[in-house]
Interface confidence: low
Amino acid sequence: PSGLVTANITDSEALARWQPAIATVDSYVISYTGEKVPEITRTVSGNTVEYALTDLEPATEYTLRIFAEKGPQKSSTITAKFTTDLDSPRDLTATEVQSETALLTWRPPRASVTGYLLVYESVDGTVKEVIVGPDTTSYSLADLSPSTHYTAKIQALNGPLRSNMIQTIFTTIGLLYPFPKDCSQAMLNGDTTSGLYTIYLNGDKAEALEVFCDMTSDGGGWIVFLRRKNGRENFYQNWKAYAAGFGDRREEFWLGLDNLNKITAQGQYELRVDLRDHGETAFAVYDKFSVGDAKTRYKLKVEGYSGTAGDSMAYHNGRSFSTFDKDTDSAITNCALSYKGAFWYRNCHRVNLMGRYGDNNHSQGVNWFHWKGHEHSIQFAEMKLRPSNFRNLEGRRKRA
């Protein structure tokens, strides 16, 4: 015979074809062997011109031989080489599917591999590829979009060889609040680590605001709107700066009166103040807290005290905000100017958390009068807010 070729090669099969001998022959003897694979020999009829090779090992180079027989006579042997495909991984499955994460698992192919190519694609056409090592049989997908259909595919790699892809389809869980309007809704979405989050004022995706969420204090879900901790940020700022906000959300900052107004206009909010000084801690919670709009000069409403720091904010209830360039307090002097800060001053303050850091002169520092008086500047202070009914929501969420 002549012209021995192989076709239709897969990971376990191939088809051998040849040109028949010119003379009539009784049979053809076909043998094939590969590395670490014992030789297999088959005899087929003399009028056959192809033979299906089955049960082959994947990713293996085979040597195929064929000769013709007529009675006791044998023709010369012709040879061809071919390599089987790499077999695919098996049983690709998505488990532990959450709103933004999923775990892909699979069983390895029979052939040895040098790695795997993972491709996952969302319905909107976003495609991501990742190559993982040969001993890996699972991979955690992160940063997925909630309520989204995904197709995940995997392909085994062995040097230049690539297996067929197998795939699985899964859908991420929908977020309870796709556009959380505060840190409590972010928390109810399952985010439980304190840090930077994007919230959406009134749940409007066009009104995005980056905030720091305290997810640990008293059950979490707090938007932090003021932090004093080291004196690096200048809090002696003008009206415009206090309206807009300033500082680094991870460090010392003020979130901004406009933002506070918009947030507290979303519903009923409570205020929490956490204070720390030389290992001592104190807190104050007010179950009704709101900040008016610019027309009211960001008028403060704060009621319903509980805590350990003392009710110093009651003195400021109903007051408008004051800065050195916009004096709205009831004192003869300009409180903000006198105390180098800004606040809902009255005449002038029992609370001065935006005062001069580390200044222990009377009323100049970071003061909470009913805890440390007017002549002690507190080392650490945070003001934060969350919905007043958070406990109720959280309790219902846990129980229902």
Epitope: G174, L176, P178, L188, G203, Q268, R399
Partner: antibody, heavy 119, light 107 residues
Framework: EVRLVQSGAEVKKPGASVKVSCKVS????????MHWVRQAPGKGLEWMGG????????IYAQKFQGRVTMTEDTSTDTAYMELSSLRSEDTAVYYC????????????WGQGTLVTVSS | DIQMTQSPASLPTSVGDRVTITCRAS??????LNWYQQKPGKAPRLLIY???TLQDGVPSRFSGSGYGTDFTLTISSLQPEDFATYYC?????????FGQGTKVEIK
Amino acid sequence: EVRLVQSGAEVKKPGASVKVSCKVSGYTLTELSMHWVRQAPGKGLEWMGGFDPEDGETIYAQKFQGRVTMTEDTSTDTAYMELSSLRSEDTAVYYCATAQKETYALTYWGQGTLVTVSS
Amino acid sequence: DIQMTQSPASLPTSVGDRVTITCRASQYIQGFLNWYQQKPGKAPRLLIYAASTLQDGVPSRFSGSGYGTDFTLTISSLQPEDFATYYCQNQYRGPWTFGQGTKVEIK
């Protein structure tokens, strides 16, 4: 599993009041957000009022304001809906339903109570 | 108050059909929308909450989509037990109004 069992059918005269009860089992009433929905014969669903976790209070649809009172007896885990000054158009099946988690979706429903207002 | 408008009011259809019901809110309600199914003489049953989240035990042929003011309930392949009336409900803020209902009936 929450189960809501409502009181039986009532026939009332125009101008009278009716009080429908809804007994909760499987959970305590304090753990749930109770709502009332009615459905006139051959008509759609009409939300009457219920506990709004957002405000922490019971709110009523404008249409029923002043005529409806929703109360709870936590000692017996029973909710009540009282509708006064009844008129013929108040003939309907009245359902109690509880809201799921903080999604406010009405997950569990009573079997309904038919209130007929007729002279 | 937020008004909810469903269309169509009735939908003659056959088993195996793909069914789409729309619901429009008179104001922006984000994704705060529920869908219910009601059969004659029975209490309503929650199908989908938060616009697209399938309630436990509801077959996957039901799906919800939409955001803001326009929402859709889809039944990918109608089954005999799906002939019923479907209602959308605003859950953005009280009063939590329902749509007027869409009756899916046999053609």
